[in-house]
């Protein structure tokens, strides 16, 4: 018996061939011997089966001795043995229809779980293998689960169902809802303008939700809500904003905030959360602000940084075009009685300068 695998919702074509290459009488029946369709001369006739409105044939092939049964919009319950009767012969074809669906929405928040469920006909024992967009393979039976979805899991998942040495392939598009970056760090000299950007890693036509930026300043004992906003059809509207600092927020995506100037009291870490309509859970992005200040007070030249710096970062003070006078893995360095000239304060990571501030020391007469 020939086995054909079909996909729920798809169309399948079961073949039936006569030895004579001409139009002769044929009938397609199901395992209960109920007629599905056949012919009467050049006319297609249909029987009382449940497939009535979804069954068809190709009249153009009848003259060549081919009498296919076409079933549209396949359902799991269409799984059956179909019998083609032609020239006193019976050709049997076993049709097995499978469906593969994501148990929830195909738009999932980063960190959530994806469960794929296989619908299969009674008596079948299929195996399923899925390949994620990042090339990760998962195997299972009736259900497959992936916990802790990552950004790289966004895209087309290709799943292969195997049954009776035959296979059928499903493609499911999964969108992982997340910010492009989990964390970002902004380095600024005191007084410079600060821009924070929170680009999303997905695009949808209508995006609705609400968000908030909480800020933990290094100098403060507790965190503070800097801004709350709504998102409606991709348009941002600010609901409440702190008066210090004087934040501005762009009205369109990507989410974007500006501070008029970087000050030591603003240095610290923020957490922007975005709750999307009809989704449980929130998207998060951490943002960090490091602020540098170089000052000269009497005979002391000081360079300081505030904010979340890694212990391996190096803070240096050097006279332009000369070797560093002082270099430490600390948040403040100073030089007593500095020579006249242009001094540079540098914050660097393995030789790469992250932040630089220049200060001119005048000669003392």
């Amino acid at each position: 018996k020939k086995v054909v695998l079909g996909k729920k919702g798809d169309t399948v074509e079961l073949t039936c061939t006569a030895s004579q290459k001409k139009s002769i009488q044929f009938h397609w029946k199901n395992s209960n011997q109920i007629k599905i369709l056949g012919n009467q001369g050049s006319f297609l006739t249909k029987g009382p089966s449940k497939l009535n409105d979804r069954a068809d044939s190709r009249r153009s092939l009848w003259d060549q001795g081919n009498f296919p049964l076409i079933i549209k919009n396949l359902k799991i319950e269409d799984s059956d043995t179909y019998i083609c009767e032609v020239e006193d012969q019976k050709e049997e074809v076993q049709l097995l229809v499978f469906g593969l669906t994501a148990n929830s929405d195909t738009h999932l928040l980063q960190g959530q779980s994806l469960t794929l469920t296989l619908e299969s006909p009674p008596g079948s024992s299929p195996s399923v293998q899925c390949r994620s967009p990042r090339g990760k393979n998962i195997q299972g039976g009736k259900t497959l689960s992936v916990s802790q979805l990552e950004l790289q899991d966004s895209g087309t998942w290709t799943c292969t169902v195997l049954q009776n040495q035959k296979k059928v392939e499903f493609k499911i598009d999964i969108v992982v809802l997340a910010f492009q970056k989990a964390s970002s760090i902004v380095y600024k000299k005191e007084g410079e303008q600060v821009e924070f950007s929170f680009p999303l890693a997905f695009t949808v036509e209508k995006l609705t939700g609400s968000g908030e930026l909480w800020w933990q300043a290094e100098r403060a004992s507790s965190s503070k809500s800097w801004i709350t906003f709504d998102l409606k059809n991709k348009e941002v509207s600010v609901k409440r904003v702190t008066q210090d600092p004087k934040l501005q927020m762009g009205k369109k995506l990507p989410l974007h905030l500006t501070l008029p100037q970087a000050l030591p009291q603003y240095a610290g870490s923020g957490n922007l959360t975005l709750a999307l309509e009809a989704k449980t859970g929130k998207l998060h992005q951490e943002v960090n602000l490091v602020v540098m200040r170089a000052t000269q007070l009497q005979k002391n030249l000081t360079c300081e940084v505030w904010g979340p710096t890694s212990p391996k970062l190096m803070l240096s003070l050097k006279l332009e075009n000369k070797e560093a006078k002082v270099s430490k893995r600390e948040k403040a360095v100073w030089v007593l009685n500095p020579e006249a000239g242009m001094w540079q304060c540098l914050l660097s990571d393995s030789g790469q300068v992250l932040l630089e501030s220049n200060i001119k020391v005048l000669p003392t007469w």
Epitope: V194, D230, E235, Q248, G250, K251, T258
Partner: antibody, heavy 119, light 107 residues
Framework: EVELLESGGGLVQPGGSLRLSCAAS????????MSWVRQAPGKGLEWVSG????????YYADSVKGRFTITSDNSKNTLYLQMNSLRAEDTAVYYC????????????WGKGTTVTVSS | AIQMTQSPSSLSASVGDRVTITCRAS??????LGWYQQKPGKAPKVLIY???SLQSGVPSRFSGSRSGTDFTLTISSLQPEDFATYYC?????????FGQGTKLEIK
């Protein structure tokens, strides 16, 4: 082609009210954010008020906050500006402008309607 | 509100000249700035949007650029029809704000 046509301007006494209308043709009104912009005689352009495409969010310049109200009627494809407690400094040509779908810029403007506040 | 400082307020130039007008924003506004041209008795029309994108139908002699919070409108070779008043508009956030305008006159 998208067209905007303002109406409702005229002479009004200080403290009085006027309602400006902006009829739009050739577009699905609810898709786009809209704004009112004014220009006092011999002066520059001043943004007055804006409304989101959904009509849910409205915004105002500080100079008109509490006195002007922007609304829209999607079924009539019309934008309105209700102006109360009018002052001499509100005298201007009032333009309505449509914003782009993906961008904020004002890509279509009406010809303007003149409001004169004088006793 | 975000302040837009436009300069110069007026400018005399000749046909064929290269002209630049600048706007400075008091806050970072990304590329969310447009340049508009207005002729006497007429409504403004957009020339440049998103700081540097040329509006459809606008001659290529008009161009826009951004450096941080400084924005520039350049007319590479002035034509007689370019004598008008030019405004920048920040559409980053509400309330939107225009620059004070630059009146471009024939020398």
């Amino acid at each position: 082609e998208v067209e905007l046509l303002e109406s409702g301007g005229g002479l009004v006494q200080p403290g009085g009210s006027l309602r400006l209308s902006c009829a739009a043709s050739g577009l699905t009104f609810s898709t786009f954010a809209m704004s009112w912009v004014r220009q006092a005689p011999g002066k520059g352009l001043e943004w007055v008020s804006g409304i989101s495409g959904s009509g849910e969010n409205t915004y105002y310049a500080d100079s008109v906050k509490g006195r002007f109200t922007i609304t829209s009627d999607n079924s009539k494809n019309t934008l309105y500006l209700q102006m109360n407690s009018l002052r001499a400094e509100d005298t201007a040509v009032y333009y309505c402008a449509k914003e782009g779908y993906n961008w904020n810029y004002m890509d279509v403007w009406g010809k303007g309607t003149t409001v004169t506040v004088s006793s | 509100a975000i302040q837009m400082t436009q300069s110069p307020s007026s400018l005399s130039a000749s046909v064929g000249d290269r002209v630049t007008i600048t706007c400075r924003a008091s806050h970072g506004i990304r590329n969310d700035l447009g340049w508009y041209q207005q002729k006497p008795g007429k409504a403004p029309k957009v020339l440049i949007y998103e700081a540097s994108s040329l509006q459809s139908g606008v001659p290529s002699r008009f161009s826009g650029s951004r450096s941080g919070t400084d924005f520039t409108l350049t007319i590479s070779s002035l034509q007689p029809e370019d004598f008008a008043t030019y405004y920048c508009l920040q559409d980053y956030t509400y309330p939107y704000t225009f620059g004070q305008g630059t009146k471009l006159e024939i020398k």
